[in-house]
């Protein structure tokens, strides 16, 4: 009976996500058979989040809207470990929008999910950000410094990275 009601709950939760994510990849969390964490297929997972690399070239605002439709946001990077995970799935000759912007052009950078911008946990390339008109952030590869952030024009189409919380069922 208990297992039946748990299964019903899981099915109803899965139905919520089915519209945007017809397939989920789930793993058992810990030793308890009842706790599963899922990411949409073919998203990748790291800690409590799921990540999707969007290879379509779009402006920053359209990229954020695209993530939003999937129940996600453009990626907010909180730690060096998180960035190190993300870059494993990126192509060196491409640039990818982050969920970081400065719409007022006053160097008040803000994350899309309202996470406070912490100057101590940023990974700007040297000399960046360097242009008040460049109000959106990308992550890209420079041979001298490897992967880091750069400010660019928001309207310039780029690839992007979406991030969402894992789905627990």
């Amino acid at each position: 009976n208990f297992m039946y009601s748990k299964t019903v709950k899981r099915l109803s939760k899965l139905r919520e996500y089915q519209q945007y994510h017809p397939s989920l990849t789930c793993v058992m969390e810990g030793k308890d058979i009842e706790d599963w964490s899922c990411c949409p297929t073919p998203w990748t997972s790291f800690q409590s989040s799921c990540y999707f690399i969007s290879t379509g070239m779009q402006s920053w605002t359209k990229s954020q809207k695209n993530c939003s439709v999937m129940g996600a946001d453009l990626v907010v990077i909180n730690t060096r470990e998180e960035q190190d995970f993300i870059i494993q799935n990126l192509k060196r000759n491409s640039s990818y929008f982050l969920g970081l912007s400065d719409p007022g052009g006053r160097r008040h950078w803000q994350w899309v999910d309202q996470t406070p911008y912490n100057e101590n946990v940023t990974f700007w390339h040297s000399g960046e950000p360097n242009n008040l008109d460049e109000r959106c952030a990308i992550i890209n590869f420079r041979s001298s410094e490897e992967w880091g952030w750069n400010d660019i024009h928001c309207h310039v189409p780029q690839k992007s990275i979406c991030k969402m919380k894992k789905i627990y069922i």
Partner: antibody
Framework: EVQLVESGGGLVKPGGSLRLSCAAS????????MSWVRQAPGKGLEWVST????????YYPDSVKGRFTISRDNAKNSLYLQMNSLRAEDTAVYYC??????????????WGQGTTVTVSS | DIVLTQSPASLAVSPGQRATITCRAS??????????MHWYQQKPGQPPKLLIY???NLESGVPARFSGSGSGTDFTLTINPVEAEDTANYYC?????????FGGGTKVEIK
Amino acid sequence: EVQLVESGGGLVKPGGSLRLSCAASGFTFSSYGMSWVRQAPGKGLEWVSTISSGDSYTYYPDSVKGRFTISRDNAKNSLYLQMNSLRAEDTAVYYCARQLYYSYGYYFDYWGQGTTVTVSS
Amino acid sequence: DIVLTQSPASLAVSPGQRATITCRASESVSFHGTHLMHWYQQKPGQPPKLLIYAASNLESGVPARFSGSGSGTDFTLTINPVEAEDTANYYCQQSIEDPPTFGGGTKVEIK
């Protein structure tokens, strides 16, 4: 006073080349993105190319990509448009315009008087 | 590319009356309360002149009889009251993504 003065237009045969110039004054040229916008006779406005303030970014519509090249010389306060392989449909008045950024986009806050390019055999 | 459709293509208005021009975008040009639609006036033989930026902000030096409104995909430029000197073509332009695109224009004539 902000001023943008275009030059270099003229009559050219199909397949020919022209180089347009835009002399800027009255503002810190190196701090602004710049664009070329054209207007065919009796028609509407068509954006032709953009260059960022730091010269790091240029962009073109498919109609001119590979044929037109935008460039700038911040030391000379000048914007250029090199036009090669010209076609009859490139006939237009070409305006130089200054971009002013606003939030996630921009608008054109100052325009030159334009220079006329005629492509005809 | 985002397509901007202006209507009407032309209109004739008596001095003192209201003129209303609409611009419809093929997709939203708004994001988090910012509307990246702009309006320009072009008189015969002259370059375009900025009137309104970001849907509703009046450019410095532009008479207060010009106003703009709208969000998402639908935007309006209003001239009220129209004066004889307002005879011109009016264009909308979006800048939320490249390439920047212009509407086809609306010709306003004063009766």
